[in-house]
């Protein structure tokens, strides 16, 4: 019983370097505690961007120094990644783990390609 995780294929960060996307999972069971991890894949290397464990119906709580924020609604998680720069352009994978009650399930999305364009510096203006 594989758990399916869906996320958009492409997202463009805004001019402030913020990107948002929805991670939706088809829960095979009635999970009450869920862990969501955002992973970045580049050159076959995978690194953790941020992670949060939450109780169904409650808010996601990321660490204070996390670049991620999020909200949950049913089997959907709305994720926002802040402080992105052009060099952070890449594939961001949503991983969902149903931690409790048993059995444990893990689901991995296909990834969202986030494009980040650094804003042009404002030219000096002559007054």
């Amino acid at each position: 019983k594989a758990m399916h995780v869906a996320q958009p294929a492409v997202v463009l960060a805004n001019s402030r370097g913020t990107a948002s996307f929805v991670c939706e999972y088809a829960s095979p069971g009635k999970a009450t505690e869920v862990r969501v991890t955002v992973l970045r894949q580049a050159d076959s290397q995978v690194t953790e961007v941020c992670a949060a464990t939450y109780m169904m119906g409650n808010e996601l709580t990321f660490l204070d120094d996390s670049i991620c924020t999020g909200t949950s609604s049913g089997n959907q998680v709305n994720l926002t990644i802040q402080g992105l720069r052009a060099m952070d352009t890449g594939l961001y994978i949503c991983k969902v783990e149903l931690m409790y009650p048993p059995p444990y399930y893990m689901g991995i999305g296909n990834g969202t390609q986030i494009y980040v364009i650094d804003p042009e510096p404002c030219p000096d203006s002559d007054f």
């Epitope: 019983k1 594989a2 758990m3 399916h4 095979p28 505690e33 862990r35 991890t37 992973l39 995978v46 690194t47 953790e48 994978i93 991983k95 931690m99 409790y100 048993p102 059995p103 444990y104 399930y105 893990m106 689901g107 991995i108």
Partner: antibody, heavy 118, light 108 residues
């Protein structure tokens, strides 16, 4: 370099208790879920249980539930498996393994042979 | 519990030849949750393939994985002397994690 170094071989009598360990280095231990797996000629590779990154969640195979306990000490970068009420059929090589970000066991310890014999 | 069944139990192949190993799951596991490991005598298993077809870091391109749902295949395109070993498939999408019984690839 990622390394998982396990404690040495153990010989125990049926009914005894043993605790084996797995000391890790080369990665941030507190970010990873860890597993114990055993291997014997009769049972092949058998998953025993896992413990979440923070130790809050533990799952066990039905075959060892109630007898085996997994724990971790993130400050010491160490994972443990305590086995109680040992039986002859628990004789096996025991491996610790790390869960990679995308699911499979990407790094394994060298194995600890536990022999249960009267 | 998802039961993983591998075939054949033993495969006799000459160096340089192609080897095809099969793994069948008792229920769908999804391609993202199927891994292959190589094990040599006295050593721990080593991850070869994850997500059914992605090679782990440092794994030679002669190893390839395919399949989805319940049927998966590991192919070694041209067997090298160091490839003679036992290979295991495993599902990692739900507890309990389960392994196949292994396919031993031996020199013909």
């Amino acid at each position: 370099e990622v390394q998982l170094v396990q404690s040495g071989a153990e010989v125990k009598k049926p009914g005894a208790t043993v605790k084996i360990s797995c000391k890790v280095s080369g990665f941030t231990f507190s970010h990873y879920t860890m597993h114990w797996i055993r291997q014997s000629p009769s049972r092949g590779l058998e998953w025993l249980g896992f413990i979440s990154y923070d130790g809050n969640y533990k799952y066990y195979a039905d075959s060892v539930k109630g007898r085996f306990t997994i724990s971790r000490d993130n400050a010491k970068n160490s994972l443990y498996l305590q086995m109680n009420s040992l039986r002859a059929e628990d004789t096996a090589v025991y491996y610790c393994a790390r869960t990679g970000w995308l699911g499979p066991f990407d790094y394994w310890g060298q194995g600890t042979l536990v022999t249960v014999s009267s | 519990e998802i039961v993983m069944t591998q075939s054949p139990a033993t495969l006799s192949v000459s160096p340089g030849e192609r080897a095809t190993l099969s793994c069948r799951a008792s229920q769908s596991v999804g391609s993202s949750y199927l891994a292959w490991y190589q094990q040599k005598p006295g050593k721990a298993p080593k991850l070869l393939i994850y997500g059914a077809f992605s090679r782990a870091t440092g794994v030679p391109s002669r190893f390839s994985g395919s399949g989805s749902g319940t049927d998966f295949t590991l192919t070694i395109s041209s067997l090298q002397p160091e490839d003679f070993a036992t290979y295991y498939c495993q599902q990692d999408g739900s507890s309990p994690w389960t392994f196949g019984q292994g396919t031993k690839v031996e020199i013909k």
